[in-house]
């Protein structure tokens, strides 16, 4: 009888099925939907989380201007195809044989096509801009306190290396968090910025993916930071390929 058998759950992903049947009675966890093994010491990939979610029952500017190539996830939820390592496959298709190419965070980066559509490689999202608007407060937050708190959050809760939090901008009531991570910078074991951003997004919406932890309680010097709107922009290492028709619509 081991500690694992007493508490066989996945601290970093509640959308798992766990059983104490690993070596020496260790707890072994698999993602809902895909049945893939999950490493409970770090964040689960966004692709496996989306798959699990789809399998579950339905329930004078200092701010950054997103570039013309920035993508916003307008397509919403879909049941993705993940590769054996849990990453998004470059080409995604639905049940009606409509296909499209996605980036490393699973956001569509081409027009939709048919089964003949080719997506040669999974293009990496290397820059994520998280744009938040907080609820009215008595006064503005102190910028350096806000910066420190958000960096602490990404380091401690999401285990994202501090070097990948490029900047925190603030112009009341708008907060922008910039995450940057090139392919060459990401070492084995590093949390992916796309996964950290997805966990943060779900936390902000009150849909925490962590097992048994309370929801996100963000405070800056004791003052609650309550977010009322979130927009996330994704920038890829290679610009997306959309037809002019979409760009002028």
């Amino acid at each position: 009888h081991t500690a694992a058998q007493d508490n066989c759950t996945c601290p970093t992903n509640k959308m798992t099925v766990c059983s104490p049947d690993g070596p020496g009675g260790r707890c072994q966890c698999r993602a809902l939907g895909s049945g893939m093994a999950v490493d409970c010491s770090t964040l689960t990939s966004k692709c496996l989380l989306l798959k699990a979610r789809m399998s579950a029952p339905k329930n004078a500017r200092t701010l950054v201007r997103p570039s013309e190539h920035a993508l916003v996830d307008n397509d919403g939820l879909y049941d993705p195809d993940c590769d054996p390592e849990g990453r998004f496959k470059a080409r995604q298709c639905n049940q009606t044989s409509v296909c499209w190419c996605v980036n490393s965070v699973g956001v569509r980066r081409t027009d939709k096509g048919d089964l003949s559509l080719r997506c040669d490689e999974l293009v990496r999202t290397h820059h994520i801009l998280i744009d938040l608007r907080h609820r009215p407060t008595a006064g503005a937050f102190n910028h350096s306190d806000l910066d420190a708190e958000l960096r602490r959050l990404f380091r401690e809760r999401y285990r994202l290396h501090p070097k990948f939090v490029a900047a925190v901008h603030y112009e009341q009531p708008t907060i922008q968090i910039e995450l940057r991570q090139n392919t060459s910078q990401k070492a084995a074991g590093d949390v992916d910025i796309g996964d950290a951003a997805y966990y943060f997004e779900r936390d902000i919406k009150g849909e925490s993916l962590f097992q048994g932890r309370g929801g996100l309680d963000l405070r800056v010097r004791g003052e609650p930071l309550q977010v009322e709107r979130t927009l996330i922009y994704y920038l890829d290492e290679i610009p997306p390929k959309f037809s002019m028709k979409r760009l002028t619509a």
Epitope: P23, R26, C27, A37, C40, P84
Partner: nanobody, 121 residues
Framework: QVQLQESGGGMVQVGGSLRLSCAAS????????MSWVRQAPGKGPEWVSY????????YYPDSVKGRFTISRDNAKNTLYLLMNNLKPEDTALYRC??????????????WGQGTQVTVSS
């Protein structure tokens, strides 16, 4: 990138033996824990043996204990699985996997394509 290539599978009679090999590359094999995992048609994956990085600790589930032996040669970056007294229920695709064992959890993070083992009666 991590690559794991299994060999040694095949068809064998009940009670027979097979020795599987797994050639590893793309990561520091000598500091990695490793496992053999099998998957029978229509069933989920099941680990059948585990060995730590230096080969000093091994684990087996009850279903194969006393029949299967896992070993490794770190100089050759190769993992082995000796399977004796094979039974029809051992029929499956066998894959080697890089593994991680903590005080409480176990996970595999990379797998080979696998080698098929078929035990006929």
């Amino acid at each position: 990138q991590v690559q794991l290539q299994e060999s040694g599978g095949g068809m064998v009679q009940v009670g027979g033996s097979l020795r599987l090999s797994c050639a590893a590359s793309g990561f520091p094999f000598s500091s990695a824990d490793m496992s053999w995992v099998r998957q029978a048609p229509g069933k989920g994956p099941e680990w059948v043996s585990y060995i730590n990085a230096d080969g000093s600790k091994t684990y087996y589930p009850d279903s194969v204990k006393g029949r299967f032996t896992i070993s490794r040669d770190n100089a050759k970056n190769t993992l082995y699985l000796l399977m004796n007294n094979l039974k029809p229920e051992d029929t499956a695709l066998y894959r080697c996997a890089r593994a991680k064992l903590t005080d409480t959890h176990y996970v595999e993070d990379y797998w080979g394509q696998g080698t098929q083992v078929t035990v006929s009666s």
